[in-house]
Amino acid sequence: VPRWRQQWSGPGTTKRFPETVLARCVKYTEIHPEMRHVDCQSVWDAFKGAFISKHPCNITEEDYQPLMKLGTQTVPCNKILLWSRIKDLAHQFTQVQRDMFTLEDTLLGYLADDLTWCGEFNTSKINYQSCPDWRKDCSNNPVSVFWKTVSRRFAEAACDVVHVMLNGSRSKIFDKNSTFGSVEVHNLQPEKVQTLEAWVIHGGREDSRDLCQDPTIKELESIISKRNIQFSCKNIYRPDKFLQCVKNPEDSSCTSEI
């Protein structure tokens, strides 16, 4: 008789999830020699241990602590780039500006990027059919808790000037409910972080508005200022040109505003 299985509202675990996590771990250690002390089998075991046999609405940050410990990594604290709703451009930027890091440039972020996973209470099975949706089912699901945990740690590690890339095409350029708005902003350490500099990325070719004056940006400025961190904001009118100028800063067209 087939066992009754909980139906969740979100997509199920990504296919080949164990193989993908293990392969990503090995790839990461191959291209980041400083992380070759990491035992990828142990990393996978710790990852699995965080959610297997546990109710997928009952996951805690504590469940991920063994994984966090194994994935401990030092990134230059003054070279951190946060992002909200504009992941691809942020990653294109750190791909060119090699000394800056998004969360997905770290081992733990790289392992989980774009993946979904969950288990079931009291069985060692991975649920490939469905996983809890943050809104419709529960917020303490394996994926959400993972990203909350690693994002908090990443923000806590930041120092000096922290940059954040924001999507100027969205109705809420700064969204208090995003991971950046709900976790990272509140975990920047005022005794270490001097300034949060927002880069607002324009979507339209002819959009010359100053999106730094957007009400949601003013809201971000207020939150940050209350935390005794300075705030600055820049419009990136031409993201394509911006990337090109990061690649080739000596290009004559790169002196004008981008």
Epitope: V26, K27, P33, D113
Partner: antibody, heavy 123, light 112 residues
């Protein structure tokens, strides 16, 4: 079985570009970093760069930074290496290569190689 | 970049006799994980290179046990206990401790 099959020999003019392909089979293409190595006639091997086929991220040797572009087509399980502004010194055999995984650790040695693509640059 | 220096550049050997190739690196190739990231390859005439040894002393799959690798952090040796005719070609050492991975100039082994 695991195979890397490269495109055929090319003859190119100075100043032009060449794009060499490397088709992977017998394994999950996105699970391994792909490297490119070249060898000029009678010379030693020289590493050019890598691509992560899953994300498309790359890293290049300083020497080739301005002239090489490594890309991939996930649907075709194929990696590409394009070298621009060709000069006579770029006449070489170009190889794609990847490591083996020994009990969940990258061996650090290129265990699998393509058959090589000879690129001849003439004026 | 780490510089790899091989010697000799040419090595004539009688079949059945032993052979030894040296390789020096400009920096230690010992990682904090305890592994030494030194590889040996053989490139037979008209072929792609083939991996013989990785992590300084571990033989790659299918490599005969007459091949062995040894060394310390910066000085490495590839030994062939009894050379066979099929062993002719160019031998390269390579470091993979850091990027860019770098190769030695090669040692050409030929049969006397």
């Amino acid at each position: 079985q695991m195979q890397l099959v490269q495109s055929g020999a090319e003859v190119k003019k100075t100043g032009s570009s060449v794009k060499v392909s490397c088709k992977a089979s017998g394994y999950t293409f996105t699970d391994y970093i792909m490297h490119w190595v070249r060898q000029a006639p009678g010379q030693a091997l020289e590493w050019m760069g890598w691509i992560d086929p899953e994300y498309g991220s790359t890293d290049y040797a300083q020497k080739f930074q301005d002239r090489v572009t490594i890309t991939r087509d996930r649907s075709m399980s194929t990696a590409y290496m394009e070298l621009s502004s060709l000069r006579s010194e770029d006449t070489a055999m170009y190889y794609c290569a990847r490591v083996a995984i020994i009990t969940t650790v990258a061996s650090g040695g290129f265990a699998y190689w393509g058959q090589g693509t000879l690129v001849t640059v003439s004026s | 970049d780490i510089v790899m220096t091989q010697s000799p550049l040419s090595l004539p050997v009688t079949p059945g006799e032993p052979a030894s190739i040296s390789c020096q690196s400009s920096e230690s190739l010992l990682h904090s994980n305890g592994k030494t990231y030194l590889n040996w390859y053989l490139q037979k005439p008209g072929q792609s290179p083939q991996l013989l040894i990785y992590w300084m002393s571990t033989r790659a799959a299918g490599v005969p046990d007459r091949f062995s690798g040894s060394g310390s952090g910066t000085d490495f040796t590839l030994k062939i206990s009894r050379v066979e005719a099929e062993d002719v070609g160019v031998y390269y050492c390579q470091q993979f401790l850091e990027y860019p991975p770098t190769f030695g100039q090669g040692t050409k082994l030929e049969i006397k």
